[in-house]
Interface confidence: low
């Protein structure tokens, strides 16, 4: 059953004398493996014998016998799916039909393949896109219906006989569907390639020529133009004539329209290949070109720059930058339309010519206030001198100048006065808008530049002001020199360094912290009595009577200041001791008698000792000696001794008389 055999292979294979042929082939015999294979050349079926007659190129049978010519023809297949064949070399008389006689255990099949062998290598075929336009990338394809593993070939591209430098991509196909070699070349043709010959050349492995195919390029392109001008340098003066001619060097397809453009804009009613400009004006200066169109699009010539020369036009000045800050750099640029360009410039400042300034630019590296004003210029070229334009204004800004702080008060200023200061300046640009004062006080700071200090303090030393526009300029500080009475007056003991004892040499100093003016007088006072007029009060030998409350006064031309009262304390041993008796120095027996030791001492007496008429100390140590009841035997002279930290003092004798009571006298 023939339907059981399925074959796939190229229908026809192409080669040439001496080359080789590789036949890719697959099959499927559904009833089992292949047992016999014979390759016939031009097989014919013999009805008598029920077999195929023809030249046997290859034979593979069950017993494995192989004909001797089978070295040229090789069966590269297998027993169940591959039926690939190779003939190497292939000859002209191999052309015709190849018959593959296949036999399995139960089935037989004859498969036919066409082989076309030419005498010489056949040419490849170049394929071009339907239309080629300049600068658009196209792919050129060269196709050859041949490929064989045993016979390497190459395809090379030539343009006008010269190898093309673009890299080509070569691919081969040896499949059951197709057998070919293909070369593809990507190429961006220019208008100049129009009409040129492209060749695809088939070569063997050694680069030997085998065959070729050629095509002529038809490159569609916009018109290619050349422009010519009279005069050739395109430099004229106002009133001259100019002629421009447009020539088409190439166009595919033919051109259809012509126009002229100036600075990219079409000139009306100019549709011929010649442009005549009569009595030109400077406005006609510019870039001219001609434009010619075809079906591809418009083509433009190179531009011709027509220069109509004229004397400089009235100039303007550009300032970089105004307003300018004092000390900064400023550049002035003289701008004047002229052709040819100005060769010389004259500069003016406030109408006066600036000497030595002949360039297009004037650079002032360090601007000062006097540079302010109007700047103008005049430009000059070979055709004449331009007019001076309106000029430009340079505004020079700077901080306030020569700022001073001025005291408006009559001098001297006294503590407590109201002081008025003003902030003055010489000049300022822009105007002064505010003022600042140092140090900052509790006073109000009006913006008018006048400062009022109510009740000025003795310690307001210096004041400085600043006048401010965009910047602040500070004046040097001014001294208020406020005058005031002596301050912080106090009494200070200079000697002795320790406590004052009676008899010591004592010095008191009248101190003060400051005084303005410095010239001062001193006064010492005790209990409202003037003691001295020096800064020191001296006692050669102090006595307890000198103790008391002392004050010193310091005065200057502004006023006088007193110290706080200072207490002078003199330490001395107990003195002026005496024994007083209560109720008296005569007491009746049985009554009570109190003896008191009175004394003057600083510090007070801390310890008392009592003595009798025999100078015998009594066992009593308080200030009072109480005798109760008093006896006659107590009569006699008593004295006391007082002790403090400085020393001791004793009293004179005081006599106590104790007399008998009437009862005692009655008993006797």
């Amino acid at each position: 059953d023939s339907s059981k055999w399925v074959f796939e292979h190229p229908e026809t294979l192409y080669a040439w004398e001496g080359a080789c042929v590789w036949i890719p082939c697959t099959y499927r015999a559904l009833d089992g493996d292949l047992e016999s294979f014979i390759l016939f050349h031009n097989p014919e079926y013999n009805k008598n014998t029920s077999k195929f007659d023809g030249t046997r190129l290859y034979e593979s049978t069950k017993d494995g016998k192989v004909p001797s010519e089978q070295k040229r023809v090789q069966f590269l297949g297998d027993k169940n799916k591959n039926c690939t064949l190779s003939i190497h070399p292939v000859h002209l008389n191999d052309s015709g039909q190849l018959g593959l006689r296949m036999e399995s255990k139960t089935e037989k099949w004859m498969e036919r393949i066409h082989l076309n062998v030419s005498e010489r290598p056949f040419p490849p075929h170049i394929q071009l896109p339907p239309e080629i336009q300049e600068s658009q990338e196209v792919t050129l394809t060269c196709l050859l219906n041949f490929s064989c593993y045993g016979y390497p070939i190459q395809l090379q591209w030539l343009l006008e006989g010269v190898p093309m430098r673009q890299a080509a991509v070569t691919s081969t196909s040896l499949t059951i569907k197709s057998v070919f070699t293909r070369s593809e070349l990507k190429f961006s043709p220019q208008w100049s390639h129009h009409g040129k010959i492209v060749t695809c050349q088939l070569q063997d492995a050694d680069g030997k020529f085998l065959s070729n195919d050629t095509v002529q390029l038809n490159v569609k392109h916009t018109p290619k133009l050349e422009i010519k001008v009279t005069p050739s340098d395109a430099i004229v003066r106002e009133g001259d004539s100019v002629t421009m001619t447009c020539e088409v060097s190439s166009s595919n397809p033919e051109y259809t329209t012509v126009s002229w453009l100036k600075d990219g804009t079409s000139l009306k009613k100019q549709n011929t290949f010649t442009l005549n400009l009569r009595e030109v004006t400077k406005d006609q200066s510019g870039k001219y070109c001609c434009q010619v169109s075809n079906d591809v699009g418009p083509g433009r010539s190179e531009e011709v720059f027509l220069q109509v020369q004229y004397a400089p036009e009235p100039s303007t000045v550009q300032i970089l930058h105004s307003p300018a800050v004092e000390g900064s750099q400023v550049e002035f640029l003289c701008m004047s339309l002229a052709n040819p360009l100005p060769t010389n410039y004259t500069w003016y400042h406030n109408g006066k010519e600036m000497q030595g300034r002949t360039e297009e630019k004037v650079h002032i590296p360090k601007i000062l206030p006097w540079h302010a004003g109007t700047y103008s210029c005049v430009a000059e070229n070979i055709l004449g001198t331009g007019q001076r334009g309106p000029g430009a204004e340079l505004d020079v800004q700077y901080p306030p100048k020569k700022v001073t702080t001025v005291i408006q008060n009559p001098m001297p200023i006294r503590e407590g006065d109201t002081v008025t200061l003003s902030c003055n300046y010489n000049s300022s640009n822009p105007s002064v808008t505010r003022y600042e004062w140092k140090p900052h006080g509790a006073w109000e700071e009006p913006s008018l530049g006048v400062l009022k200090i109510q009740n000025v303090g003795w310690d307001n030393t210096t004041i400085a002001c600043a006048a401010c526009n965009s910047w602040c300029s500070w004046a040097s500080p001014v001294a208020l020199n406020v005058q005031y009475a002596p301050r912080d007056v106090r009494v200070r003991k200079i000697k002795p360094l320790s406590e004052i004892h009676s008899g010591n040499s004592v010095s008191l100093q009248c101190d003060f912290s400051s005084s303005h003016p410095k010239e001062v007088q001193f006064f010492w006072e005790k209990n409202g009595r003037l003691l001295g007029k020096e800064s020191q009060l001296n006692f050669d030998s102090i006595s307890p009577e000198d103790a008391g409350s002392y004050s010193c006064w310091v005065n200057n031309s502004i006023g006088q200041t007193a110290s706080k009262a200072w207490t002078l304390e003199v330490l001395y041993a107990p003195r002026r001791l005496r024994v007083s008796m209560s109720p008296g120095d005569q007491v009746m027996e049985g009554k009570s008698a109190t003896l008191t030791c009175e004394s003057d001492a600083n510090p007070p007496v801390s310890h008392y000792t009592w003595f009798d008429w025999n100078n015998q100390s009594l066992p009593y140590h308080s200030q009072k000696l109480r005798l109760e009841p008093v006896k006659v035997q107590h009569s006699g002279a008593y004295w006391c001794q007082g002790t403090n930290s400085v020393g001791k003092g004793r009293s004179p004798l005081s006599t106590l008389t104790v007399y008998y009571s009437p009862e005692t006298i009655g008993r006797r």
């Epitope: 340098d233 395109a234 430099i235 011709v304 720059f305 220069q307 040819p340 360009l341 060769t343």
Partner: nanobody
């Protein structure tokens, strides 16, 4: 197409001289104001000198005045820069430029590729 090709650059000692040339092709040379610019590493391109279409007037940047001189030869489509008393701060790539207007801005119609000038101390 338009080409501006500079030459003449190289390595010199401070105080030496060099002459740069720029050959133009593909343009009507006499229709263009020709300039030299330079660009030092890490800095912007700056104007050095320029010359009018007929060879006058010429303009020079303040930094090169008295040391560099620009000139042109319209017959040879060439512009030159004679550089004397070269200083290390003149080290840069020097570019030739063709332009319609004579402003000293870094805008030009056509530029060259540049030539390196190195001045060692």
């Amino acid at each position: 197409q338009v080409q501006l090709v500079e030459s003449g650059g190289g390595l010199v000692q401070a105080g030496d001289s060099l002459k740069l040339s720029c050959l133009a092709s593909g343009i009507t040379f006499s229709s263009y104001y020709m300039s030299w610019f330079r660009q030092a590493p890490g800095k912007e391109r700056e104007f050095v000198a320029g010359v009018g279409r007929s060879g006058a007037p010429s303009h020079h940047a303040d930094s090169v005045k008295g040391r560099f001189t620009i000139s042109r030869d319209n017959a040879k489509s060439a512009v030159y820069l004679q550089m004397n008393s070269l200083q290390p701060e003149d080290t840069a790539v020097y570019f030739c430029a063709a332009k319609w207007m004579a402003a000293s801005t870094t805008v030009a119609d056509y530029w060259g590729q540049g030539t390196q000038v190195t001045v060692s101390s």
